[in-house]
Structure formats: structure tokens, C-alpha cells
């Protein structure tokens, strides 16, 4: 059978239960429910999942049983709408329940909250966690799925199953170790950081599909898969793109059972045909399903075939360019993108998409001109500035990162972005700028050939975080413009923003700059966030402050914190020295 050509099933829920198995079925339904109803208590979700699972089992036993022929959206939506406190907890989301499918599911999707009002996850003591793990492993792991899914409503569900498997393995190993904490904590830190990155990457895929459409996502996928599988034929890449688009459309649309099932099929197809796809897949394909799918998604680029011909001959010099373009525009542009991308693993995907867009725009214009060939003959010259712009930007910023180190590089970006878009909330500016700053440690260590794909594609992910957070509470026309005009030009759009001259500085509030002894017990990371929050507020009060002025104030602030944390009476020190610091800072900044 073809990868996604299944016979029609009398009962969709029975079909997915049988394909996925009970354990994965239950986990995926829990993720789906937690991503939709993000405020519901864990116990309520477990109850709903158990009810759905029992129902699925009746359908497996008899596909003709009552309601077994209903769609998954109908079954799941009906179940979600039985929640008694829907109106009190979710307000207008309860109105979704008055709608029929497919409108009801679309309504639920629109109410997913990228920044839900949930308490920060606090990690208990290792012994407490190990006891909970041993007492009830199943509940412990379900709780992990629930807590991640409700905080990350677009997390890639089959990948979350992979994280849960690693989470379980970490506890299984480390709770038996001599030094439990030394074994477990680094593993949990790694899972947390990888999880945040995975969530953000998937959020960009969903935004691409939902805000810019399937064609935009497919173009991204053609470019990325052509870089990764440069020896594969265009038709092979096209087939993988079509299947991958289906998988992500399903997951982004809340169809998690179908998504996980189709992702498994795609991994199976790739491994069965790896000789035609990539020489780098062998190790991945020897792994169990969840590891295999993850491994394929992260696999390194295959080597480029030797002696690839010049692209100019057929895409610029040929007299048949317009004829070929007119015959099948998207196939021709797809081939252009495929051929360009497989030759350029050193370019970011977004750069490749800018080049393809430039090529398309040129052909649209020139193929209607009197002398098309004369008109499009210099199209490759137009690529040069597009390539040089990210190259120069990365070079400059990596030099700055190497000079400053991560924390101070983040601070430079905090100042830069607060001046560009001062209306954005301080927590969002801190979170986004900190993540932008991580590009330094993540990418600047790479050789030139790997820097751009690492840096610019990572920045696309981070700027999408800004876009989705800003969309919830729009405050800046400039952010809206950069986020909505062009997916591939978001980063250049933000880079091009200058200081917002229309911004009226924020009123000074001493409370914002009042600190207490509790700062002394914070982790280094939390302390940095406190200082960076103060820095953003400073810039919002004094957007025209120079780097030197801001540096002086921040240095004084760091010295103040260090001094008071060493004092015998910390709270008194913070109160008295804090007043002096505020006064000195106001004077230094002319507030």
C-alpha cells in the first residue's frame, strides 16, 4: 500500500487504536485533551482519557457498535464538551460547544493559548521525584505528558512520546544510582532545554501552515529536505514533502492520532527506501520507532553528489525558461528550489526561499516582457545582496558574541530590541532576547559553512515566538507588520527596524527597581533574568540612553546585588542601598 492510502475504515477510532496500540493511544489522547483544555486538572483529563479508551475498545471488538462510526473530532469534541466547568474556566471557549464539526474543532484550535496563565513548573527534590516514580510510574509519566502538553499546546505529539520515553529512562536509571541527583539533574536539564527547542521549532511549522498556508510549508520542506538528502531525486523529495506536510498539518490541527500514525508510516517508508534517499539513515533505521522518527528528523545532511551541473544553463541561459515555467509553474519553481538547496547546505532555508521568491517574481515579470531572455538574464546577480546580508549580519554578531560572552550579548540584544519595539511586554522582550542571544553559543562555534543555516533558521524559530506571543496581545504595529508580511523576511524585517521615534517613554516607577534579599537565593539564570528585566525597564524609561550609560548603571546594579547578598542584614542593605542606586541611576540617565 502507499504510505497514506488505507482502505476506508468503518470505525476510525478502532483503526487508530489498533494501529497505535493502547499505550500510545492513551498518551496521545491525553496530549490532545491537555493541549485543548489547558486549565483542566490532571485528574479530570485522566478520567476523560479512560472513558475514550474504554469506548475505543468497544469499537475494536465491534466496529459496528453505536457511535463507532463517528469521526475522531466528533468523539473527542463531544467528550471535551462534557466538562462541567467549561464556561467558568474558559469563558468564551465554551461557545465552541454550540458549533458543529468541523467548525467546533476550528474553534477549539483558535482558543489554544501560547502563554497560558499556569504556574512555573518547580522541580521537587530528587528523592521526592524518585518516590513518586516508584509509587506509580504510570501516573508519574502521564503527569509529565499533561504538564508539557498544557504549557506547549502545539508540541509535536509523537515527539512528546519520545521525550516521555527518555524521561522514564532517566528515572529508571538514576533512581537506582548511588548519587541520584548527579545522575538525574543533568538529564532533566537536557530534556527541558531540548523540549523547549522542540516546542518552538514545531510552533514555527504550525504558524507557517496556519498563517501562510500549505504552499509556504511545502516550499520550506522542499528546501530543507533537498539540503538534507541531496542525492535523492526530485520526485523522492516531492513525495517526502507531500507526506511530511500531511503529518504536520494533522498535528497542528489537533489530529494527533492520525499524525502519529502517519509519522510512523513515513519513517517506515524512508527506511525501506533509504538507498534512494540518503546514505546517512542506516543508524536511524536500526532504532525502535520513536527513536527512529526522531533520528530521521535530526539526521545530518548527506554528502552532495559530485559534479552537479551549473544551474545557470537551464534556469537562466536557456531560451526555454518561460516555456518550461508556463507549463507547470510550481513544479518548475520546486525544481529550482530543489536544485539550489541541494547545492547549498551552507545557506539557511529562509535564504533559499528568498532566492526562489526573487526568481519567481523575475519570471512573472520577464515572461510577460517583449524580450524575456534579455529581461531575466541577470536574475542571479540579484541573489548576491540577498546572500551577503545574512552573511555579514552573522559575521558581525558572532564577533560581538565572542567579545562579550553570552550574558552580555543577550543584554546588547535586549537593548537593541527594546529600542526597536518598546511597546512589547517586558517578560516577552526578556524571553525573546535571551533566546536570540543563545544563537551565539549555538552557532558561532561552527565553521563558516554551517553558521548561516544554524543561525538564521534558529532566529526564525525565536522570532516566531515573538510573533505568536504578540498576536495574543498586539501592542506594536511594527511587530505585526514584520510578523505578517512575509514568513521568510521576518528576520530581515526586524533587523531593519531602527529605534522607534514615536515611542513615549514610560513613567518612572521606583517599585520596578526595588529588589529584595530573595534575589540572593535565586539560581544564576534567575538572577540574570531579574537584571535583564531591570535593563529592559531602564530602556523603556530612557530609550535614548547610550550603551555607556546603560553599562554603567548595570555594573552598579551588579555590584549592589553582590554587596547586599554578602551583607549580614541583607534586607536592610537592599532597602537602603537600593534607594541610593535608584537615585544614582536616575541622575546618570538624566531621569
Amino acid at each position: 500500500r502507499g504510505v497514506f492510502r488505507r482502505d476506508a475504515h468503518k470505525s476510525e477510532v478502532a483503526h487508530r487504536f489498533k494501529d497505535l496500540g493502547e499505550e500510545n493511544f492513551k498518551a496521545l489522547v491525553l496530549i490532545a485533551f491537555a493541549q485543548y483544555l489547558q486549565q483542566c486538572p490532571f485528574e479530570d483529563h485522566v478520567k476523560l482519557v479512560n472513558e475514550v479508551t474504554e469506548f475505543a475498545k468497544t469499537c475494536v471488538a465491534d466496529e459496528s457498535a453505536e457511535n463507532c462510526d463517528k469521526s475522531l473530532h466528533t468523539l473527542f469534541g463531544d467528550k471535551l464538551c462534557t466538562v462541567a466547568t467549561l464556561r467558568e474556566t474558559y469563558g468564551e471557549m465554551a461557545d465552541c460547544c454550540a458549533k458543529q464539526e468541523p467548525e467546533r474543532n476550528e474553534c477549539f484550535l483558535q482558543h489554544k493559548d501560547d502563554n497560558p496563565n499556569l504556574p512555573r513548573l518547580v522541580r521537587p527534590e530528587v528523592d521526592v521525584m524518585c518516590t513518586a516514580f516508584h509509587d506509580n510510574e504510570e501516573t508519574f509519566l502521564k503527569k509529565y505528558l499533561y504538564e508539557i502538553a498544557r504549557r506547549h499546546p502545539y508540541f509535536y505529539a509523537p515527539e512528546l512520546l519520545f521525550f516521555a520515553k527518555r524521561y522514564k529512562a532517566a528515572f529508571t536509571e538514576c533512581c537506582q544510582a548511588a548519587d541520584k541527583a548527579a545522575c538525574l539533574l543533568p538529564k532533566l536539564d537536557e530534556l527541558r532545554d531540548e523540549g523547549k527547542a522542540s516546542s518552538a521549532k514545531q510552533r514555527l511549522k504550525c504558524a507557517s501552515l496556519q498563517k501562510f498556508g500549505e504552499r509556504a510549508f511545502k516550499a520550506w520542506a522542499v528546501a530543507r529536505l533537498s539540503q538534507r538528502f541531496p542525492k535523492a531525486e526530485f520526485a523522492e523529495v516531492s513525495k517526502l514533502v507531500t507526506d511530511l506536510t500531511k503529518v504536520h498539518t494533522e498535528c497542528c490541527h489537533g489530529d494527533l492520532l492520525e499524525c502519529a500514525d502517519d509519522r510512523a508510516d513515513l519513517a517506515k517508508y524512508i527506511c525501506e527506501n533509504q538507498d534512494s534517499i540518503s546514505s546517512k539513515l542506516k543508524e536511524c533505521c536500526e532504532k525502535p520507532l520513536l527513536e527512529k522518527s526522531h533520528c530521521i528528523a535530526e539526521v545530518e545532511n548527506d554528502e552532495m553528489p559530485a559534479d552537479l551541473p551549473s544551474l545557470a544553463a537551464d534556469f537562466v541561459e536557456s531560451k526555454d525558461v518561460c516555456k518550461n515555467y508556463a507549463e507547470a509553474k510550481d513544479v518548475f519553481l520546486g525544481m529550482f528550489l530543489y536544485e539550489y538547496a541541494r547545492r547549498h547546505p551552507d545557506y539557511s532555508v529562509v535564504l533559499l526561499l528568498r532566492l526562489a521568491k526573487t526568481y519567481e517574481t523575475t519570471l512573472e515579470k520577464c515572461c510577460a516582457a517583449a524580450d524575456p531572455h534579455e529581461c531575466y538574464a541577470k536574475v542571479f546577480d540579484e541573489f548576491k545582496p540577498l546572500v551577503e546580508e545574512p552573511q555579514n549580519l552573522i559575521k558581525q554578531n558572532c564577533e560581538l558574541f565572542e567579545q562579550l560572552g553570552e550574558y552580555k550579548f543577550q543584554n546588547a540584544l535586549l537593548v537593541r530590541y527594546t529600542k526597536k519595539v518598546p511597546q512589547v511586554s517586558t517578560p516577552t522582550l526578556v524571553e525573546v532576547s535571551r533566546n536570540l542571544g543563545k544563537v551565539g553559543s549555538k552557532c558561532c562555534k561552527h565553521p563558516e559553512a554551517k553558521r548561516m543555516p544554524c543561525a538564521e533558521d534558529y532566529l526564525s524559530v525565536v522570532l516566531n515566538q515573538l510573533c505568536v506571543l504578540h498576536e495574543k496581545t498586539p501592542v506594536s504595529d511594527r511587530v505585526t507588520k514584520c510578523c505578517t508580511e512575509s514568513l521568510v523576511n521576518r528576520r530581515p524585517c526586524f533587523s531593519a527596524l531602527e529605534v522607534d521615534e514615536t515611542y513615549v517613554p514610560k513613567e518612572f516607577n521606583a517599585e520596578t527597581f526595588t529588589f529584595h534579599a530573595d534575589i540572593c537565593t535565586l539560581s544564576e539564570k534567575e538572577r540574570q533574568i531579574k537584571k535583564q528585566t531591570a535593563l529592559v525597564e531602564l530602556v523603556k524609561h530612557k530609550p535614548k540612553a547610550t550603551k555607556e550609560q546603560l553599562k554603567a548603571v548595570m555594573d552598579d546594579f551588579a555590584a549592589f546585588v553582590e554587596k547586599c547578598c554578602k551583607a549580614d542584614d541583607k534586607e536592610t542593605c537592599f532597602a537602603e542601598e537600593g534607594k541610593k542606586l535608584v537615585a544614582a541611576s536616575q541622575a546618570a540617565l538624566g531621569l
Epitope: 516531492s238 534512494s276 551541473p309 537551464d314 516555456k323 536544485e339
Partner: nanobody, 125 residues
Framework: EVQLLESGGGLVQPGGSLRVSCAAS????????MGWFRQAPGKEREGVSS????????FYTNSVKGRFTISRDNSKNTLYLQMNSLRAEDTAVYYC??????????????????WGQGTLVTVSS
Amino acid sequence: EVQLLESGGGLVQPGGSLRVSCAASGNTYLTSCMGWFRQAPGKEREGVSSIYTVGGSTFYTNSVKGRFTISRDNSKNTLYLQMNSLRAEDTAVYYCAAGSPARCRLRDPTTFDYWGQGTLVTVSS
């Protein structure tokens, strides 16, 4: 819509060389992916090599890499397969095929839409 005509087959000694050609006529956009397949007696048809007439990328099955070279002359709408270091196991009827680049895959003959009649290549001493 599209006609493909192979030529150049014949008898050649092991270690020898041969060039087969395929002339295409009709709507050539429909032939922007072209390939060579072969079928030995009692065996399934297998992909040998393919080329995109836009972009010029080439693909080979493992058993012929380094020995066979596919090329095309767009101005003449002709496809070539230069076969060097021929072996007895290369004996087969060689078919020219064409299709859309969005569909054609060398490992799957059903993804090619148009076929020639074939030309026999015999490698024997």
C-alpha cells in the same frame, strides 16, 4: 503525445563500450525527466540512469556507477547512455522512458509515463 525511439544497441565484447541514443518528439515538457531502464530475459525491468532536462541532475543505479554516463542534448531532444567496461550481466533490452520530474523515480518504472520500444544490448565474447 510523446514518442521515444531508441537506437545504437548491438553486440559488444566484455570490457567494451557502446552508446545508445533516444530521440524524443512531441510535447518535450512532458519528457523533462528522462531515464534508461533495462530488462534481462526472465528478470524484472530495472532503472539504470535518469536525468532532468531542466537542471541537468543525473542519477545512477549502484551497479553502473562509474561505468555508465547519461547525457542529453536539449536542442536535438535526444538522450544518450554511454556504457563503458561492459559486463555480461549488462546484457538486456534497454528502454528509454520519460515523465514528469515531480513523479519519476528510477527505482520505480511505473512513475515514468512514456516508453520507447527498446534496443537490445548483448555483451558476449
